[in-house]
Amino acid sequence: LQDPCSNCPAGTFCDNNRNQICSPCPPNSFSSAGGQRTCDICRQCKGVFRTRKECSSTSNAECDCTPGFHCLGAGCSMCEQDCKQGQELTKKGCKDCCFGTFNDQKRGICRPWTNCSLDGKSVLVNGTKERDVVCGPSPADLSPGASSVTPPAPAREPGHSPQ
């Protein structure tokens, strides 16, 4: 026997209390698939969250963050305070990057400057709190008779989780 609830489309629910007829989702709720026995409560974008997409009877609301904050987590489940470039967010608020580290974004952590000497290169431009050092050619590349074309150094992955 076919479940009578399977005929209820998205935007409705199968009402156990009314002989399993399909009733529309009430205000502030939705069902994104057919055959549901309950509509779910719409997400509400409050406080630092703002509404990116309104809830409808067939889809949940979507939130993003108010200016000065950025989304974290699946579906923007959290809003985290922005900091300035050259800073990172700590429990005590935004703090400047320590010497030898930088952050070129408004989010994330301060990361160590690239150590040019590990690749046998020299520092072409010093690092700042906002920018990584720029590595120049190695001393050998500057010696007479050296090839004028050198392969680019492999990009170094700083040790931090993707933002």
């Epitope: 629910f13 199968c14 009402d15 156990n16 209390n17 009314r18 009733s23 989702c25 009430p26 502030n28 709720s29 698939a33 549901q36 026995r37 309950t38 509509c39 779910d40 409560i41 719409c42 509400q44």
Partner: antibody, heavy 121, light 106 residues
Framework: QVQLQQSGAELARPGASVKMSCKAS????????MHWLKQRPGQGLEWIGY????????NYNQKFTDKATLTADKSSSTAYMQLSSLTSEDSAVYYC??????????????WGTGTTVTVSS | QIVLSQSPTILSASPGEKVTMTCRAS?????IHWYQQKPGSSPKAWIS???NLASGVPARFSGSGSGTSYSLTISRVEAEDAATYYC?????????FGSGTKLEIK
């Protein structure tokens, strides 16, 4: 008959996590939403959030988004709530409660036995 | 969020008396649910959608109201009615409860 049996009392240190359970019996687990509520000694009731066991959809009171994580296991008809980074403010009785989504009135018609959480160093 | 204010905080009544407790919402709600809780026990469903008595609730209980003002009335109080009664709404997320009215029997 319809019953919600909750796990036993928990004693935890500040900063720790606890995970409590709510085993449903006497009805089809996936036809109803499961809600979690907090009651501090001598105080009123606070809604933490709910899970729809059929879809896994969760909706939280914003106050508890960083505190509580709700899950459900359809195969055992059991709902779970994990509380993290515990402080003394989390010492309370926690209830699971069933809501008949069909009524669309979000009314808690059956309540669990309650789990007491005590946070102490 | 919608705040529910219950009054009185404590209600003292003699057996046979009629008592009424109120639940006021900070903004209009579609309906109110009521729960009964006795010391050391879980809350129990008592009245749903403003006026529908839950299974097993005596007919001396009734509920009414609309908009921002709701009430629970007991026509003739009995000793077994001693408990705390909470109102609850969900017209707006999150669900909220009143702080409770404690009914004491003299």
């Amino acid at each position: 008959q319809v019953q919600l049996q909750q796990s036993g009392a928990e004693l935890a240190r500040p900063g720790a996590s606890v995970k409590m359970s709510c085993k449903a019996s006497g009805y089809t687990f996936t036809f109803y939403t499961m809600h979690w509520l907090k009651q501090r000694p001598g105080q009123g009731l606070e809604w933490i959030g709910y899970i729809n066991p059929s879809s896994g959809y969760t909706n939280y009171n914003q106050k508890f988004t960083d505190k509580a994580t709700l899950t459900a296991d359809k195969s055992s008809s059991t709902a779970y709530m994990q509380l993290s980074s515990l402080t003394s403010e989390d010492s309370a009785v926690y209830y699971c409660a069933r809501s008949d989504g069909s009524s669309s009135k979000w009314y808690f018609d059956v309540w669990g036995t309650g789990t007491t959480v005590t946070v102490s160093s | 969020q919608i705040v529910l204010s219950q009054s009185p905080t404590i209600l003292s009544a003699s057996p046979g008396e009629k008592v009424t407790m109120t639940c006021r919402a900070s903004s209009s709600v579609s309906y109110i649910h009521w729960y009964q809780q006795k010391p050391g026990s879980s809350p129990k469903a008592w009245i749903s959608a403003t006026s529908n008595l839950a299974s097993g609730v005596p007919a001396r209980f009734s509920g009414s109201g609309s908009g921002t003002s709701y009430s629970l009335t007991i026509s003739r109080v009995e000793a077994e009615d001693a408990a705390t009664y909470y109102c609850q709404q969900w017209s707006s997320n999150p669900f909220t409860f009143g702080s409770g009215t404690k009914l004491e029997i003299k």
